[in-house]
């Protein structure tokens, strides 16, 4: 297996996932496509943790670009050994992957908490409340209770969909970074297999 090619593939995947995370998090600020709730501060507290923008997004771009750079063929080597530089780079990518694990882990945890607590909404008493906070996430299984939120329109569906997307994307990012930790360790210890004779697509 070509460790560099695999790292590059993971890197490209992470860029796409990071951009999707950022988009999903931004959408959480505009329930039903409206700006008024952000300006009135009527959004779930977990939206303000920037889990998708920072954790699953910007923080994920650092390891992503490191992984993409690993496949370049212009490493000059060291100590007379052609692959030494690339092996060092593969090992250093493990550090980048650990940053990615931290970012994606943060994204997953915040998204899970956001799902469990439910949205901030105008409840059936005409009060802005975390209507489903006391249900310990059981509201997710009982859609008949979702009408308890009278405003924003379809806020429960909006929050559940986007936090679920963030949870899934963050989970995939976490797995990919974990794979790169293994890939980086193997690539650093076992050597860099990529050569002009051996090319693999991810």
């Amino acid at each position: 297996m070509c460790y560099g090619k695999c790292a590059r593939c993971i890197g490209h995947s992470l860029v796409g996932l990071a951009l999707l995370c950022i988009a999903a998090n931004i959408l959480l600020y505009f329930p039903n496509g409206e700006t008024k709730y952000a300006s009135e501060n009527h959004l779930s507290r977990f939206v303000w943790f920037f889990s998708g923008i920072v954790g699953g997004g910007l923080l994920m771009l650092l390891p992503a670009f490191v992984f993409i750079g690993l496949e370049q063929d212009d490493c000059c080597g060291c100590c007379g050994h052609e692959n030494c530089g690339k092996r060092c780079a593969m090992l250093s990518s493990v550090l980048a992957a650990l940053i990615g694990i931290a970012g994606s882990g943060y994204c997953v945890i915040v998204a899970a908490l956001g799902l469990a607590e439910g949205p901030l909404c105008l409840d059936s008493l005409g009060q802005w409340n975390y209507t489903f906070a006391s249900t310990e996430g059981q509201y997710l299984l009982d859609t008949s209770t979702w009408s308890e939120c009278t405003e924003p329109k379809h806020i429960v569906e909006w929050n559940v969909s986007l936090f679920s997307i963030l949870l899934a994307l963050g989970g995939i990012e976490f797995i990919l970074c974990l794979i790169q930790v293994i890939n980086g360790v193997l690539g650093g210890i076992c050597g860099f297999c990529c050569s002009h004779q051996q090319q693999y697509d991810c």
Partner: antibody, heavy 120, light 106 residues
Framework: EVQLVQSGAEVKKPGASVKVSCKAS????????VKWVRQAPGQGLEWMGW????????IYAADFKGRVTMTTDTSTSTAYMELRSLRSDDTAVYYC?????????????WGQGTLVTVSS | EIVLTQSPATLSLSPGERATLSCRAN?????INWYQQKPGQAPRLLIY???NLASGIPARFSGSGSGRDFTLTISSLEPEDFAVYYC?????????FGGGTKVEIK
């Protein structure tokens, strides 16, 4: 001046439906909820439900679920309450009331009331 | 459902006297509102959030209480104060009103 103006008195037969309108003026209609309350002759006040005028989402009191429909027309700043399958004990004055969302949710502006008489 | 019991049902007093109206809930509530209703008229908000005076309401009206027991006090009755008074809660659904206290001229 902030006010709620309701439609005129109605006389209906048992089993029929009645639709009461409530036109708001003097304030931004969608910033407040509209609650409906009724008062039978010589009796106390009974809550029927309320509607979120911004989203159009209604919340009905259990006693009226399935029989009442609350709607709004934001273009005319009007709230409507329709009560179906009328019975003689539905004879009452029906009030629409404005309320502010928040911790206290008080009802500061009341319509003049609409008398609905159900009689065969 | 939270039941509000108002007492007394009728209060007979003279102008200038102090009126104390009681409203008791069958379980703890966070706040109460008070309304005044005169014959042939819609109710009018007097007190909101237990103790806050509504706009345009004279200072002789005051509210107090917490938990299950709430009180509306009219320090010195004026002729226009003779009416029916309702307490109302919305700490939980359904929203409920008390049965009313009629303040009549003695």
């Amino acid at each position: 001046e902030v006010q709620l103006v309701q439609s005129g008195a109605e006389v209906k037969k048992p089993g029929a439906s009645v639709k009461v309108s409530c036109k708001a003026s003097g304030y931004t209609f969608t910033n407040y909820g509209v609650k409906w309350v009724r008062q039978a002759p010589g009796q106390g006040l009974e809550w029927m439900g309320w509607i979120n005028t911004y989203t159009g989402n209604p919340i009905y009191a259990a006693d009226f679920k399935g029989r009442v429909t609350m709607t709004t027309d934001t273009s005319t700043s009007t709230a409507y309450m329709e009560l179906r399958s009328l019975r003689s004990d539905d004879t009452a004055v029906y009030y629409c009331v404005r309320f502010q969302y928040g911790d206290y949710r008080y009802f500061d502006v009341w319509g003049q009331g609409t008398l609905v008489t159900v009689s065969s | 459902e939270i039941v509000l019991t108002q007492s007394p049902a009728t209060l007979s007093l003279s102008p200038g006297e102090r009126a104390t109206l009681s409203c008791r809930a069958n379980s703890g509530i966070s706040f109460i509102n008070w309304y005044q209703q005169k014959p042939g008229q819609a109710p009018r908000l007097l007190i909101y959030g237990t103790a806050n005076l509504a706009s345009g309401i004279p200072a002789r009206f005051s509210g107090s209480g917490s938990g299950r027991d709430f009180t509306l006090t009219i320090s010195s009755l004026e002729p226009e104060d003779f009416a029916v008074y309702y307490c109302q809660q919305w700490s939980s659904n359904p929203l409920t009103f008390g049965g009313g206290t009629k303040v009549e001229i003695k």
